[in-house]
C-alpha cells in the first residue's frame, strides 16, 4: 500500500502479512497486507486491528477489527464507546457510511481515526498529537512502526521509476512490480481517470496512476481520492497536504 | 464519586458552557448553578476527599458571586438526553478532564501539534 508517515514522507510499500502501523503507550494498530494480484509485489490492506489500551479512568481496553467486506461500526465486544469508566465517552465509534466508512474518536488522546473500505481493500488515516506519537516506553522497539519510521528500504517500491517506464511507449513487463499488468488499461486512460478525481498532480495522483496500471481496478482511484480527503480533514498543516515527488533519498534514509 | 456527572450536566444546561451569560440569561444561568450546587452537595459523601469535588464547590461559589446569584431560588430542569443505543454500556460515562486531551493539554501549554498518517491503495 501507499504510506504517508507522520513526518510527511510518502512511500509505496510491498510489506506483506501483518505489520505494526502504530505502536505506542496508548494504542496499537496492525495491518495485514495481501498481494493485489497473484505473484504481484504490490500489496493492499485486507485486515486492520486497532487496540485502544486501558487508560486511567477513561477507557477500558477496546479492540476494533476490520477485514475485507467487514467494516464493523462497533468494537469487538459489541460496544460503541470506551466501556464502563467515568470517561467512557471519550472513545466513540461513529458509522459514517454503513459498511464503507467509520470514524473513531479517542478524545482522551486527542486522536481521530478514519477507516474505510474502498473496493475490496481497506484504507486507514489518523490524526494524532506529537506527544502521543512519541509516547513509546521502549525506543528500540520503534524500528518497524510504519507510521513513524516508514517501511524498510527493502520493502519499498520505486513507483517513480515505474512511472517513467509506464510513460515510455514500450512498457516492458519486467519494469512493473506486477508480472500480470492488465494490458486493457493504457497509461492515458489511467491518467485521465485519476485526473478526474485528483486534479493536482501530487503524490496521491501518482499513486492513483500506479494503482490503476498495476491492477486495472478503478476502485483504487477512489482509495487515493478518499486518502486525500481524509488528509484534508486530519492534517493540521493544510500547506503540507499535497506532497510532490522529491529527488530520491540516499539508501538508509527514511524515504 | 459522581461529581463528573454534575459537571457535565451543568455544562450541558448552560449550552455553550460559557462563564459569561448575556444579561437576560442570568436568571437561567443562576438556576443552572443552583442545580449544580445541589448536585455537588449530593455527591459530598462519596467525593468530599477528591479534587474534582472541591474544584466544583469553589467554582460554584465563584460563579454565584460573579453573577450575583442568590443561594435560594429556582433550579433548572436537566435537559432531556436521547438514550444511548441499546447494548452500549453507559455506566460511569461522564468525561473527566483527564479524558479530554485538548482540555487537559491547554492547561499546561499551547495547543498540541498534530500529525497525520495514512495508508491506502496498493
Amino acid at each position: 500500500p501507499h504510506l504517508r508517515t507522520f513526518t510527511d514522507h510518502f512511500q509505496t510499500c510491498k510489506v506483506q502479512g501483518a505489520w505494526p502501523l502504530i505502536d505506542n503507550n496508548y494504542l496499537n494498530v496492525q495491518v495485514t497486507n495481501t498481494p493485489v494480484l497473484p505473484g504481484s509485489a504490490a500489496t493492499a490492506t485486507s485486515k486492520l486491528t486497532i487496540i485502544f489500551k486501558n487508560f486511567q479512568e477513561c477507557v477500558d481496553q477496546k479492540v476494533y477489527q476490520a477485514e475485507m467486506d467487514e467494516l464493523p461500526s462497533a468494537f469487538a465486544d459489541g460496544s460503541k464507546n470506551g466501556g464502563d469508566k467515568h470517561g467512557a465517552n471519550s472513545l466513540k465509534i461513529t458509522e459514517k457510511v454503513s459498511g464503507q466508512h467509520v470514524e473513531i474518536q479517542a478524545k482522551y488522546i486527542g486522536t481521530t481515526i478514519v477507516v474505510r473500505q474502498v473496493g475490496r481493500y481497506l484504507t486507514f488515516a489518523v490524526r494524532m498529537p506529537e506527544e502521543v506519537v512519541n509516547a513509546v516506553e521502549d525506543r528500540d522497539s520503534q524500528g518497524l512502526y510504519l507510521c513513524l519510521r516508514g517501511c524498510p528500504l527493502n520493502q519499498q517500491i520505486d513507483f517513480q521509476a515505474f512511472r517513467a517506464n509506464a510513460e515510455s511507449p514500450r512498457r516492458p513487463a519486467a519494469a512493473s512490480p506486477s508480472p500480470v499488468v492488465p494490458e486493457t488499461f493504457p497509461y492515458e486512460t489511467a491518467v485521465a481517470k485519476c485526473k478526474e478525481k485528483l486534479p493536482v498532480e501530487d503524490l496521491y495522483y501518482q499513486a492513483c496512476v500506479f494503482d490503476l496500471l498495476t491492477t486495472g481496478d478503478v476502485n483504487f482511484t477512489l482509495a487515493a481520492y478518499y486518502a486525500l480527503e481524509d488528509g484534508k480533514m486530519l492534517h493540521s498543516n493544510k500547506d503540507k497536504l499535497h506532497l510532490f515527488e522529491r529527488t530520491r533519498e540516499l539508501p538508509g534514509a527514511v524515504a | 464519586c459522581k461529581i463528573l456527572k454534575c459537571n457535565s450536566e451543568f455544562w450541558s444546561a448552560t449550552s455553550s458552557g460559557s462563564h459569561a451569560p448575556a444579561s437576560d440569561d442570568v436568571p437561567e444561568f443562576c438556576a443552572a448553578l443552583r442545580t449544580y450546587a445541589l448536585c455537588t452537595r449530593r455527591t459530598a459523601r462519596t467525593c468530599r476527599g477528591d479534587l474534582a469535588y472541591h474544584s466544583a464547590v469553589h467554582g460554584i461559589e465563584d460563579l454565584m458571586s460573579q453573577h450575583n446569584c442568590s443561594k435560594d431560588g429556582p433550579t433548572s430542569q436537566p435537559r432531556v438526553r436521547t438514550l444511548p443505543p441499546a447494548g452500549d454500556s453507559q455506566e460511569r460515562s461522564d468525561s473527566p478532564e483527564i479524558c479530554h486531551y485538548e482540555k487537559s493539554f491547554h492547561k499546561h501549554s499551547a495547543a498540541p501539534n498534530y500529525t497525520h498518517c495514512g495508508l491506502f491503495g496498493d
Epitope: - | 464519586c1 449530593r42 468530599r48 476527599g49 477528591d50 472541591h54 483527564i98
Partner: antibody, heavy 115, light 112 residues
Framework: EVQLVESGGGLVQPGGSLRLSCAAS????????MNWIRQAPGKGLEWIGM????????HYADSVKGRFTISRDNSKNTLYLQMNSLRAEDTAVYYC????????WGQGTMVTVSS | DVVLTQSPLSLPVTLGQPASISCRSS???????????LEWFQQRPGQSPRLLIY???SRFSGVPDRFSGSGSGTDFTLKISRVEAEDVGVYYC?????????FGQGTKLEIK
C-alpha cells in the same frame, strides 16, 4: 491500569511503631482522597481512615484515633500510615484504597503485633 | 456506628445456579436527598477486595452483568444470576452514607 502497592509491614512488638507506604500509579494520585482499611486474619474488613486529596482533612476510626496518622506525598504518588502504640489487636493485612469511596485496592501488607 | 448484618454467612451454591446475599442496616442508608450509598465487594481467596456494585445497583467497571444489586432504606441484596467457579470468595457490603464507613461481616460463597 490503577495500581496500588503497599509495603512496610512486618513483625513488631506491642507498643512499637511501624510506617506503611502505598505507592500509586495508573491514575492522577493528587486528585483523589485515599483510604486505609485492614483485615484481621480470618476476619472481616475494618475501615481505618481517609485523607483528602490535598491533606486538608483526615478522618479516623475511633479504634485508631490518636495512635495512627495518615499522610501523603503527592509529588511521590505515595500514601503513608504511621502506626504508633501498636496492640495485638492491630494484627491484620493493611490495604490502601483509591477514592473517597474506595474503588481500587492494593494487594495489602501484613502487620503482626506480637511479643 | 451503623451495623451491617449479612446473611447467610455461608452460601453453598451449585455451578450455574443463582445466588442471593442479604445485607441489613441498623439504620436507613438513604440521605435526605434520596441517595443511598451502599456498595458490594468481592474478595476471592488470597486476593484483595474488588468493587462490584456501587450506590446499591450500579455495576462497576468490568463487572460481569450476572452481578446485580437492589434494595433501599435498610434492606439490600446482591444477586448472582448464574454462579461460576471464579465467583468463589467472600462478599462484603459497605455503607458510606454515615461516618464512619462500615462493612458487613461477609458472606462466604462456595461451590457445592
Amino acid at each position: 491500569e490503577v495500581q496500588l502497592v503497599e509495603s512496610g509491614g512486618g513483625l513488631v512488638q506491642p507498643g512499637g511503631s511501624l510506617r506503611l507506604s502505598c505507592a500509586a500509579s495508573g491514575f492522577t494520585f493528587s486528585n483523589y482522597g485515599m483510604n486505609w482499611i485492614r483485615q484481621a486474619p480470618g476476619k472481616g474488613l475494618e475501615w481505618i481512615g481517609m485523607i483528602y486529596y490535598d491533606s486538608s482533612e483526615k478522618h479516623y476510626a475511633d479504634s485508631v484515633k490518636g495512635r495512627f496518622t495518615i499522610s501523603r506525598d503527592n509529588s511521590k504518588n505515595t500514601l503513608y500510615l504511621q502506626m504508633n502504640s501498636l496492640r495485638a489487636e492491630d494484627t491484620a493485612v493493611y490495604y490502601c484504597a483509591k477514592g473517597t469511596t474506595p474503588d481500587y485496592w492494593g494487594q495489602g501488607t501484613m502487620v503482626t503485633v506480637s511479643s | 456506628d451503623v451495623v451491617l448484618t449479612q446473611s447467610p454467612l455461608s452460601l453453598p451454591v451449585t455451578l450455574g445456579q443463582p445466588a442471593s446475599i442479604s445485607c441489613r442496616s441498623s439504620q436507613s442508608l438513604e440521605t435526605s436527598d434520596g441517595d443511598t450509598f451502599l456498595e458490594w465487594f468481592q474478595q476471592r481467596p488470597g486476593q484483595s477486595p474488588r468493587l462490584l456494585i456501587y450506590e446499591v445497583s450500579s455495576r462497576f467497571s468490568g463487572v460481569p452483568d450476572r452481578f446485580s444489586g437492589s434494595g433501599s432504606g435498610t434492606d439490600f441484596t446482591l444477586k448472582i444470576s448464574r454462579v461460576e467457579a471464579e465467583d468463589v470468595g467472600v462478599y462484603y457490603c459497605m455503607q458510606v452514607t454515615h461516618d464512619p464507613l462500615t462493612f458487613g461481616q461477609g458472606t462466604k460463597l462456595e461451590i457445592k
